[in-house]
Interface confidence: medium
């Protein structure tokens, strides 16, 4: 039975050409993260595995940076990078769970982070 | 250039134990993980685990897991891998790989130890 | 386990014909998927990564594509060096898994 729930940054906004991390926090389970992947829609950026480490997509690797934890810092943001990010947590023996955060890059000056929200 | 030279084949014995090793050569051994993989009748492809040389972390298949030993020397930047209680089902092609540092897609081969268990 | 399926494990064809091969996931592996080309008595050597990104060196010959479960190789003009067999693998979460391999011959 799957009892963790994953905590995330929820929608945050940010100046474009600036940078924002992402976020994803699992508790509520003693489950083992073996893996934990960060996508962007359909496309991956990046996997932090619990034993091997970080690896960056390529299509990412010179405005990702892996980090704070097993959080993602997106650099250099465009109004492209508005969308749905997802944090994909690999667990034993609970299995997957899935995260979003809504990310919205503003052209103004002013950029207020969201409140933080739980799925479960 | 990046090279991954490994050890030559080996003929061994049912329930005895082999260990390949993968020298490498041209570039930073501790920033890229090695991974093993073994091929059976010249077709399909499994992993059997990957390390980071950088700290020890050992990844495993768990089919190979408890069979499998993945270890690195850093001192000569060579990977090793030990495979104990061997059956005939073990007899392969055996490849040392290593990825890119962008994802788990294996760039670099090398050319591969052939394992034959037989009494 | 995540399984890789290569439907096809023999293709055959003609030089300058175009080829798909094709490979499915068992469960959704979003663009991390690689392709594979394995000559008689090779080691098997990286064409397509991350889906779509041909790796340094590979001729433009060689595209792919798809995203989730449903993945393409394609050559778009066959040539006689390209028989082999041509392996998928997702490295989307561990344990990394290969497809049967598709065995490109040509007629």
């Known amino acids: 039975m799957m009892t963790g729930t994953i905590e995330t940054t929820g929608n945050i906004s940010a100046e474009k050409g600036g940078s924002i991390i992402l976020q994803c926090h699992l508790s509520s389970t003693t489950a083992q993260v073996t893996q934990v992947n960060w996508a962007q829609q359909d496309q991956l950026l990046a996997i932090c595995n619990a034993d091997l480490g970080w690896h960056i997509s390529p299509s990412f690797k010179d405005r990702v940076a892996p980090g704070p934890g097993l959080g993602l810092t997106l650099q250099s943001l465009t109004v492209n990078d508005t969308g749905e990010y997802f944090c994909i947590y690999h667990t034993y023996p609970d299995g997957t769970y899935t995260g979003r955060i809504f990310l919205e890059v503003l052209e103004s000056s002013v950029a207020e982070h969201g409140a933080r929200f739980q799925i479960p | 250039e990046v090279q991954l030279q490994q050890s030559g084949p080996e003929l061994v014995k049912p329930g005895a134990s082999v260990k390949i090793s993968c020298k490498t050569s041209?570039?930073?051994?501790?920033?890229?993980?090695m991974h093993w993989v073994k091929q059976s009748h010249g077709k399909n492809l499994e992993w059997i685990g990957g390390i980071n040389p950088n700290n020890g972390g050992t990844s495993y298949n768990q089919k190979f897991k408890g069979r499998a030993t993945l270890t690195v020397d850093k001192s000569s930047s060579t990977a090793y891998m030990e495979l104990r209680s061997l059956t005939s089902d073990d007899s392969a092609v055996y490849y040392c790989?290593?990825?890119?540092?962008?994802?788990?897609?294996?760039?670099?081969w090398g050319q591969g130890t052939s394992v034959t268990v037989s009494s | 386990d995540i399984v890789m399926t290569q439907s096809h494990k023999f293709m055959s064809t003609s030089v300058g014909d175009r080829v798909n091969i094709t490979c499915k996931a068992s469960?959704?592996?979003?663009?991390?998927v690689a392709w594979y080309q394995q000559k008689p008595g090779q080691s098997p050597k990286l064409l397509i990564y991350s889906a779509s990104y041909r790796y340094t060196g590979v001729p433009d010959r060689f595209t792919g594509s798809g995203s989730g479960t449903d993945f393409t190789f394609t050559i778009s003009s066959v040539q006689a060096e390209d028989l082999a067999v041509y392996h998928c693998q997702q490295h989307y979460i561990t344990p990394w898994t290969f497809g049967g391999g598709t065995k490109l011959e040509i007629k």
């Open positions: 469960q959704g592996v979003s663009t991390a």
């Open positions: 041209g570039y930073t051994f501790t920033e890229y993980t």
């Open positions: 790989a290593r990825p890119g540092w962008y994802n788990y897609a294996m760039d670099y």
